[in-house]
């Protein structure tokens, strides 16, 4: 009769992830290993799994040398993959005979797989005492919450280790625009995005650019997670009296100024730098449906 060297272990995994179950059996002759599955619903029946099942999300790798070893992997997990996975082993030569009854029972080892789905998050944006408060509330969680994280534009704004099903964040009134993310920890528990409207948030590549006479300078302004998206970029050069002279694309092919803009970025290229004309403070102006924001870049030109 066959016996198990290694039985599959019960596991919890997040939806979208994968699970791997491992089973090893000994016997003489070397036993065959099969994988079976039974769902958690009352009327779910037991069905055999094969390599390529469930739209090629199920893969089975087996090795039969001194003993039998088999690994079952399920990718792209969904709630329907929750259930009991059974490793069956038999050394009976007649185990698969269509008419002759098996002489020895299949031995079985079971593992429970629970596919955890992120909870549903309700979000709200409220004005409280002239401050903007963002709230995320999780309906339920299959695992213990160990904290919360708030992010914007890839930066962590706030983090805690509270076990609550809700979390709040107060937005900086002068710097509100952008897509905020609330994350319930451990990370797959739940995540939601909240778009907060406001004037553009922009940053410059470098506060100060240095170039030499005759060369070119590239001045760059970038959107920093602005919402709504930036629709217009303008460039100015300020005189010593603060007068702002608009800079537009030169019409001639080898023109002095070239401005290339996307909602995410604007670049002003100044060619053939003149030490008497081009040094100074340049202003990039970004506009969206909520307003206008500007940033400055200082250009210094060294004479040859």
């Amino acid at each position: 009769a066959a016996g198990f060297l290694k039985a599959p272990l019960s596991q919890e995994r997040w939806a979208g992830g994968s699970v791997v179950l491992h089973c090893e059996a000994v016997g003489s002759p070397i036993p065959e290993i099969q994988w079976w599955f039974e769902g958690n619903a009352p009327n779910d029946s037991c069905s055999q799994l094969w390599d390529g099942a469930r739209l090629d999300r199920v893969h089975i790798h087996a090795a039969y040398r001194q003993h039998a070893a088999s690994s079952l992997s399920v990718d792209g997990l969904t709630a329907e993959d929750t259930g009991t996975y059974e490793c069956r082993a038999s050394s009976d030569p007649d185990r698969n005979h269509l008419t002759r009854p098996p002489r020895v029972k299949w031995v079985r080892a079971q593992a429970s797989v629970v596919v955890l789905e992120p909870g549903t998050i309700q979000t709200s944006v409220q004005e409280v005492n002239s401050k903007t408060q963002l709230t995320c509330s999780l309906n339920s969680s299959g695992v213990d919450i160990v904290g919360h994280r708030w992010m914007r534009g890839g930066k962590v704004l706030q983090e805690d280790t509270l076990p609550d099903l809700h979390t709040k964040y107060i937005v900086d009134a002068d710097d509100r625009s952008g897509e905020y993310s609330c994350i319930f920890l451990p990370e797959p528990v739940g995540r939601s995005e909240i778009n907060v409207e406001g004037p553009p948030r922009i940053k410059v590549g470098k506060k100060s650019e240095h170039s030499s006479e005759g060369e070119l300078a590239k001045l760059v302004c970038k959107s920093d997670a602005s919402y709504p998206p930036i629709t217009d970029w303008f460039w100015f050069k300020t005189s010593d009296t603060g007068e702002e002279e608009a800079i537009t694309n030169s019409t001639e092919a080898n023109g002095k100024y070239v401005v290339v803009s996307t909602p995410e970025k604007s670049q002003l290229t100044i060619s053939n730098l003149d030490v008497n004309v081009d040094p100074g403070t340049y202003v990039c102006n970004a506009t969206n449906a909520q307003g206008t924001t500007r940033e400055t870049i200082s250009l210094r030109v060294r004479s040859r």
Epitope: D240, T241, G242, T281, V283
Partner: antibody
Framework: EVQLVESGGGLVLPGRSMKLSCAAS????????MAWVRQAPTKGLEWVAS????????YYRDSVMGRFTISRDDAKSTLHLQMDNLRSEDTATYYC?????????WGQGVMVTVSS | EIVLTQSPATMPASPGEKVTLTCRAS?????IYWYQQKSGTSPKLWIY???KLASGVPNRFSGSGSGTSYSLTISSMETEDTATYYC?????????FGSGTKLEIK
Amino acid sequence: EVQLVESGGGLVLPGRSMKLSCAASGFTFRTYYMAWVRQAPTKGLEWVASISIGGDNTYYRDSVMGRFTISRDDAKSTLHLQMDNLRSEDTATYYCVRLRGYFDYWGQGVMVTVSS
Amino acid sequence: EIVLTQSPATMPASPGEKVTLTCRASSSIRYIYWYQQKSGTSPKLWIYDTSKLASGVPNRFSGSGSGTSYSLTISSMETEDTATYYCQQGRSYPLTFGSGTKLEIK
């Protein structure tokens, strides 16, 4: 909403000093030139001093050069005007203004009276 | 120093009347700027870049000119337009204002 609020005015003796401050809000202070403009009682407007973005360059009218110092604190969005060796002709309402070649926003003004 | 000369110093006008205030510069400038100041209040930017109306300025106001000669025009005078109007240049230091035109209601 752009706001410029001046403080620090009052009565001062000739030859003494006084410092005016201006708290700015509602715009990205560090990206604008700033200035002070004054108006003597029943007289016209007179530019006093201005300061560049970053504060590297300052400009003054001849009559205050060497006596007045304009400065800015971008971290606090505040503009200052240090006035030393004050004269009776410096008596005026002093306005903090945002400068773009023209003065697009004005504070409410602060009265400085130089008198013995 | 660029000197700005405003004329007239005082101008009485009747409601509905067309009014033109002038500002002459001692040397050529690119733009002129106009401000309105009512008694006891801070000046307000009224017209910038010679002809652009500042936010909230009624469209009965207009500005024009070039070089050394500039003007502010009110197509139809209203009581609320009673104020002193100053022109200013931002071309070079020292920044200078005209001496102002006091616009009064007849």
